[in-house]
Each structure stands twice: as structure tokens, then as C-alpha cells.
């Protein structure tokens, strides 16, 4: 089941997605698409990165975080009700059957009739944790090549913590944008 994120009409929506680069600047291609993740690639691509840079984007869709450090969270500017739906973040790890796929559900709420002014806040301090990788299986002798490891269990966990925390719920209700360090 998809993790659900909310935004109000007219605001910016934030859909989190992260990975751990093997080394700074050692990037993995990522695509964002509208619709659930298909077998390969992303359907209805709205943004794509390669090993160096963002190489494709469409209006209103951008990466606000430092994608060179693995923060490939998508920001959708000035959302409308039509932006509701499932979005796919796909970390395209080289080799077959390696891609990490996240389906995120965006729910757009109509704007309040008299919206109270809200101040955008940065919640780095509220969530001061690093995404670290955990071992897979038994200890191994291994040579690290130029390839990248992502532990998506932890990313999901962080996303769920954000989603489930009272602070996040309070923020969502107030319409503030949630940002992760």
C-alpha cells in the first residue's frame, strides 16, 4: 500500500524519496512518474536525473533537496486537484532486478475558504537523523565498485515516522510544508 501525503490546492506538495550514494557525486539515475511504478522505468515521466544532473523535468516539478546527496524528493508547485494520484519514485540501480520503487499517494484537499497565513518552516531540527545503511544477510568480503546500496526499509521507516508523527499531522492540518534536513 502506498504512503499517503497531503497538500492543499495552491500550495506546494512534497513527496519524499531518498537513497544513499556510494560516494559524494556518485549518483544513480532516478525517475519520477505519474502513476504507479511499472515493470521498468517510470510511466508519464515528470522528472529524471542521470549520473550527473537533472536531465529532464516538466514545469512545476522540481527537486528542492540536494539530489547529489541522494535527496531526490519531488516538489510539485502550486498544486491543483488534478495533481492527486499515485507518483512513482524509481531509483535505477545498475544491473537487473535492482531498482528500488516507491509508490507515493498524493491527496489534494480543496483550499480553505479563509486560509490562515502559515509560515513555511524547516524541520531539520525536528528530524535530525541520517539515513544509514544496514547490512544485508551475512557478513561478506566485498569490493566496492562504482556502484551504489540503498536501504529502503529505513527510508520507508523515516517516511512513516514523518507521516505518523503528531508533529507531521499538526503541520499537515495547518498546511505547512514539511521539509527533511
Amino acid at each position: 500500500s502506498e504512503v499517503e501525503y497531503r497538500a492543499e490546492v495552491g500550495q506546494n506538495a512534497y513527496l519524499p524519496c531518498f537513497y544513499t550514494p556510494a560516494a559524494p557525486g556518485n549518483l544513480v539515475p532516478v525517475c519520477w512518474g505519474k502513476g504507479a511504478c511499472p515493470v521498468f522505468e517510470c510511466g508519464n515521466v515528470v522528472l529524471r536525473t542521470d549520473e550527473r544532473d537533472v536531465n529532464y523535468w516538466t514545469s512545476r516539478y522540481w527537486l528542492n533537496g540536494d539530489f547529489r546527496k541522494g535527496d531526490v524528493s519531488l516538489t510539485i508547485e502550486n498544486v491543483t486537484l488534478a495533481d492527486s494520484g499515485i507518483y512513482c519514485c524509481r531509483i535505477q540501480i545498475p544491473g537487473i532486478m535492482n531498482d528500488e520503487k516507491f509508490n507515493l499517494k498524493l491527496v489534494i484537499k480543496p483550499a480553505k475558504v479563509t486560509p490562515a497565513p502559515t509560515r513555511q518552516r524547516d524541520f531539520t531540527a525536528a528530524f535530525p537523523r541520517m539515513l544509514t545503511t544496514r547490512g544485508h544477510g551475512p557478513a561478506e568480503t566485498q569490493t566496492l565498485g562504482s556502484l551504489p546500496d540503498i536501504n529502503l526499509t529505513q527510508i520507508s521507516t523515516l517516511a512513516n515516522e514523518l507521516r505518523d508523527s503528531r508533529l507531521a499531522n499538526d503541520l499537515r492540518d495547518s498546511g505547512a510544508t514539511i521539509r527533511i534536513g
Epitope: 537513497y19 544513499t20 550514494p21 556510494a22 544513480v28 515493470v39 541522494g70 531509483i91 540501480i93 545498475p94 544491473g95 537487473i96 532486478m97 535492482n98 520503487k101 545503511t133 544485508h136 544477510g137 566485498q142 569490493t143 566496492l144 565498485g145 556502484l147 551504489p148 546500496d149 540503498i150 536501504n151 526499509t153
Partner: antibody, heavy 124, light 105 residues
Framework: EVQLQQSGAELARPGASVKLSCKAS????????MQWVKQRPGQGLEWIGA????????RYTQNFKGKATLTADKSSSTAYMQLSSLASEDSAVYYC?????????????????WGQGTTLTVSS | DVQMIQSPKSMSMSVGERVTLSCKAS??????VSWYQQKPDQSPKLLIY???NRYTGVPDRFTGSGSATDFTLTISSVQAEDLADYHC????????FGSGTKLEM
Amino acid sequence: EVQLQQSGAELARPGASVKLSCKASGYTFTSYWMQWVKQRPGQGLEWIGAIYPGDGDIRYTQNFKGKATLTADKSSSTAYMQLSSLASEDSAVYYCARWEKSTTVVQRNYFDYWGQGTTLTVSS
Amino acid sequence: DVQMIQSPKSMSMSVGERVTLSCKASENVGTFVSWYQQKPDQSPKLLIYGASNRYTGVPDRFTGSGSATDFTLTISSVQAEDLADYHCGQSYSYPTFGSGTKLEM
């Protein structure tokens, strides 16, 4: 301890279908691809396909599309492979194997645990 | 599909000798190559992954090397228990295997 326990030997008639099982234990079944591999007597290994129980993603090699059908039951941590329209060339040992995939930091992509194999004999 | 060609088909060795098994890929597969040992009437077991990484518990007499299209498995001092078939496989694209090399004593 990771274990893959496969169903017992099968004897089938040409044209029939058979369903092989592979029960996984000792790890999170939904977090790893389960692969199926064929080995005919005295021959090499041939990849059939794979299923990712977490989201139901399935891949087949061209040679086994229409021949093999892969499914998984998350509640019992069991993967299944059904082989249809059996012929003598389907006689082989069939293995299930867990796949350790690469991540953004470590290159893996290997079959790390294998079942004991199920021998299928197709004969009239 | 990527073809994996193993040579030789079989080889006869004496205990203590150095053994070199070869595997060639029909196209560049980077270092996405693994080696598996299969003893008679047993399932395959992983020896080497990523072309040169020894898997957990594998004796250090087994060494893998190579990249792109040419790969080698070396057993520095073969033991009686190494009697087995050895399979190379690539996993850059959908997995394919060589036909195996039978090591006989």
C-alpha cells in the same frame, strides 16, 4: 537460518500441468526476489524467471513465457511455479533460489540460497 | 540474451595443483559475474560474486577475477573436496549461465 524447502519429486504425463512449491524461512519473504532455475541432467543452469513477493513484480525469460507461471503466497512465505503443457524436454531438476540484489553502495546480484531442487519427470 | 561460454568442459587435476577456469561473456557485463560450485546431487553454492568478491565462508584458495567479457576462477591449490561442476553466471541483464566446467580428480 535461511532455508528454501522445495516440494517432492513429480511424475507427470505429457500435456499435463504441475505446480512446484518453495517454502522460505529465516528471512523476510517479501523483501527478496525468488528465482527459478532449470537444470537438465548433465547440463548447465537455465534461468526461468523471478517473482518479487513484496509487490508481485514478475519477470520471465523469453523461453518460458507461456510455459511457466510464477506466484507467491505471502501468508505462508511460499513461492510457486506452475509448468503447463508438459513435454519430455521439461524433465529436469527445478531449483528455487533467493536473489540478493545490488544496492547503491554494494554490487551484489547473485543467488545466495538455493532449495534442494525438485525433480520433474515427464513420461507417458 | 548474453551468452556465457565456459572452458574447458572438463579438466582432470591432482590435489595441490593450481586450477584456472575461464568464462567469456558475449557482451560487456561489467563485473556482474558470479561463480557457483555444484557437487554431485547437490544444489549450486555461491563462491564468488561481483567477479572478484569471495562469498561468506568460501576458502581463500578460490579467487575470481576479470571484468567486461573475460572472467576467471582460480583454485590456488585444489583439494579433493573441490570435485564439482563450476558454473559462471552473469546478472547484468536477465541471468544466464555457462554450460559448466566439471573438475575431476
